[in-house]
Interface confidence: medium
C-alpha cells in the first residue's frame, strides 16, 4: 500500500481505463495505474484521477492509509436550468454522463458511437430507436426479396458503377473505412473517430485521432473579412503547442482552425490530414498521439441542437480526410 | 467576445440606495454565474455574492445580507446590484464578474461614491 | 467566513523569482485561482485551478496548492509584473479572497 518498497508493476502493458478515467502515474511514481473516481477508496499507490480535481482525503492523521477521493471546491456549474457543484457527476440524459468541474461541464457518451459498415449478413444495418430502450440499437433490415441481396453489396462496392479499386482489394479482404466522426469539441482539444478494417486481419478497429476545431479563448469573430461567410483557413497568430492531460507537444505548430459562420451556420472542418504529434508530460514520458489538421472549412447548418448538443456533435461527419 | 459593460460612477448620500448594473454580452447569459465583488480605496477585493441567471437564486456573503438585492433581467442580458442603506465606508468600486473555470471575466467596475 | 491570509508585500529584483503564499485552512482541499491587479484596472486571472494558465499569461507564472498553503511563483520577474496579487478560491458556495499582496520590482 505504501511507497516504502521496490517498483513492482504487473509484466503486462499499462491497463485498458474505462471511457473518461485517467490513466495516471501511481503514487508512488512506480506504475500506470486506473485513476479512482470520486467516492472510491485510495491510497497513496492508488491516487485519484488529478483530471477531474480529485484528491484523496484521508481524514484524521492517525488513517493516512486509505482515503476517499473526494472533489475540491470550485466553481458551481449550471446545467439545463440546475445547479451542480464542482466535482458533481449527473445524468442529463440517458445517453450522457456529465461532471461539472469548477464551472464547465464535460459529458461522456453512454451508448455506444460505434459504426457498422454493411456485410453479407447484414448488407442494410442502420440505428433505429426501439420501444423502451435509451440508446439506439443497429438493425439489420432483410431486404423484400432474398435475390436483392447480392446486388446491393456489389452495389455497396461501387463495382456496377466505377469498379473496384484494386488497392482497396487485398487477400479477400474488401478495405472500407468511414468518414472521420465530427470533433467531440466545438472548441479545445477533442476527440475524433473512425472504423476501418484496413488491417491484416481484415477485422473491424476503431481509430481515434485528436482534434481541435478551434481555440476556445480565440476571438476569432474579429478576423471574417466583410462579405465573406466562413473563415474558411484562419491562423492563429503565432505558433503554439498543443496542451493534453497536461502533457505538452514537443514541437510547435502553425495550425490551421475553423472560425465562425456570418449568416447563423457551423463553420467545422471540411479537408483534414492526420499527423502524429509527440507529447511531454512532466513525469517525462513522451506519447504519440495522431492528430487532426484542419486544411478547409465549411459552412453548414447540421448544427449542434439545443435539445442534445453532444448527440449532433457526435453524429456529424468530418469529409475529405488526406490520411 | 465576452463583455461585461457597466453603469457609470454614481454618487450617494449615507442611508440611499445604489443600483448597478452589468450587461454582458458575447456568451449565453443564462450559463454562469454572475458574482458582484467591491474594492475600496486602497484596500483589497471583498466578494459580496452571486446570482444564477437562469433561475434568479442568489446566494449573499454574511457581511451583506439584509442590505444587498441582486436581480436579472434575462431578456437584455442584464444583471443588477442593489446596495441599501448606504454608509460612508462603502465607498468603492464595485465589479460584476464571472468567475469559474479558466474563463474569468471583470466588468471595467462602477465607483460609487457615498458622502454627506 | 473563511479566511485566506496573504503577505502585504513581497520585494523582487529584476530577473529574479518572486514566490507569494496564500493561506488558510484545509486550502489544498479547494481550488485556488490568483489575480493580478494594476492600479486603475480590473482584476486579470493568471492562474487557475491551483496551477494552470489562461492563454495569454507567460509562462513564468506558475501555482501550486497543498495542505494549507497555495504559492504563485513569478520566475524571471519583470517590471511590468509590479502589481497586487490576490488568491482566491471557493469554500463551498461561497468565494473567497486573500487580502492581498504588493509585488514590488526594485
Known amino acids: 500500500q505504501n511507497c516504502s518498497g521496490p517498483c513492482r508493476c504487473p509484466d503486462e502493458p499499462a491497463p485498458r481505463c474505462p471511457a473518461g478515467v485517467s490513466l495516471v502515474l501511481d503514487g508512488c511514481g512506480c506504475c500506470r495505474v486506473c485513476a479512482k473516481q470520486l467516492g472510491e477508496l485510495c491510497t497513496e499507490r492508488d491516487p485519484c484521477d488529478p483530471h477531474k480535481g480529485l484528491f484523496c482525503h484521508f481524514g484524521s492523521p492517525a488513517n493516512r492509509k486509505i482515503g476517499v477521493c473526494t472533489a475540491k471546491d470550485g466553481a458551481p456549474c449550471i446545467f439545463g436550468g440546475t445547479v451542480y457543484r464542482s466535482g458533481e457527476s449527473f445524468q442529463s440524459s440517458c445517453k450522457y454522463q456529465c461532471t461539472c468541474l469548477d464551472g464547465a461541464v464535460g459529458c461522456m457518451p453512454l451508448c455506444s458511437m460505434d459504426v457498422r459498415l454493411p456485410s453479407p449478413d447484414c448488407p442494410f444495418p442502420r440505428r433505429v430507436k426501439l420501444p423502451g430502450k435509451c440508446c439506439e440499437e443497429w438493425v439489420c433490415d432483410e431486404p423484400k426479396d432474398q435475390t436483392v441481396v447480392g446486388p446491393a453489396l456489389a452495389a455497396y462496392r461501387l463495382e456496377d458503377t466505377f469498379g473496384p479499386d484494386p488497392t482497396m482489394i487485398r487477400a479477400n479482404c474488401l478495405v472500407q473505412t468511414t468518414e472521420w466522426s465530427a470533433c467531440s469539441k466545438t472548441c479545445g482539444m477533442g476527440i475524433s473517430t473512425r472504423v476501418t478494417n484496413d488491417n491484416a486481419s481484415c477485422r473491424l478497429e476503431k481509430q481515434s485521432r485528436l482534434c481541435m476545431v478551434r481555440p476556445c479563448e480565440a476571438d476569432l469573430e474579429e478576423n471574417i473579412k466583410k462579405g465573406k461567410k466562413c473563415i474558411r483557413t484562419p491562423k492563429i497568430s503565432k505558433p503554439i503547442k498543443f496542451e493534453l492531460s497536461g502533457c505538452t507537444s514537443m514541437k510547435t505548430y502553425r495550425a490551421k482552425f475553423c472560425g465562425v459562420c456570418t449568416d447563423g451556420r457551423c463553420c467545422t472542418p471540411h479537408r483534414t490530414t492526420t499527423l502524429p504529434v509527440e507529447f511531454k508530460c512532466p513525469d517525462g514520458e513522451v506519447m504519440k498521439k495522431n492528430m487532426m489538421f484542419i486544411k478547409t472549412c465549411a459552412c453548414h447548418y447540421n448544427c449542434p441542437g439545443d435539445n442534445d448538443i453532444f448527440e449532433s456533435l457526435y453524429y456529424r461527419k468530418m469529409y475529405g480526410d488526406m490520411a | 467576445e465576452v463583455q461585461l459593460v457597466q453603469s457609470g460612477a454614481e454618487v450617494k448620500k449615507p442611508g440611499a440606495s445604489v443600483k448597478v448594473s452589468c450587461k454582458a454580452s458575447g456568451y449565453t447569459f443564462t450559463g454562469y454565474y454572475m458574482h458582484w465583488v467591491r474594492q475600496a480605496p486602497g484596500q483589497g477585493l471583498e466578494w459580496m455574492g452571486w446570482i444564477n441567471p437562469n433561475s434568479g437564486g442568489t446566494n449573499y456573503a454574511q457581511k451583506f445580507q439584509g442590505r444587498v438585492t441582486m436581480t436579472r433581467d434575462t431578456s437584455i442580458s442584464t444583471a443588477y446590484m442593489e446596495l441599501s442603506r448606504l454608509r460612508s465606508d462603502d465607498t468603492a468600486i464595485y465589479y460584476c464578474?464571472?468567475?469559474?473555470?479558466?474563463?474569468?471575466?471583470w466588468g471595467q467596475g462602477t465607483l460609487v461614491t457615498v458622502s454627506s | 467566513q473563511p479566511v485566506l491570509t496573504q503577505p502585504p508585500s513581497v520585494s523582487v529584483s529584476p530577473g529574479q523569482t518572486a514566490s507569494i503564499t496564500c493561506s488558510g485552512d484545509k486550502l489544498g482541499h479547494k481550488y485556488a485561482s490568483w489575480y493580478q491587479q494594476k492600479p486603475g484596472q480590473s482584476p486579470v486571472l493568471v492562474i487557475y485551478?491551483?496551477?494552470k494558465r489562461p492563454s495569454g499569461i507567460p509562462e513564468r507564472f506558475s501555482g501550486s496548492n497543498s495542505g494549507n498553503t497555495a504559492t504563485l511563483t513569478i520566475s524571471g520577474t519583470q517590471a511590468m509584473d509590479e502589481a497586487d496579487y490576490y488568491c482566491?478560491?471557493?469554500?463551498?458556495?461561497?468565494?473567497?479572497f486573500g487580502g492581498g499582496t504588493k509585488v514590488t520590482v526594485l
Open positions: 485551478q491551483d496551477r
Open positions: 464578474a464571472r468567475v469559474g473555470g479558466s474563463a474569468h471575466y
Open positions: 482566491q478560491a471557493w469554500d463551498s458556495s461561497h468565494v473567497v
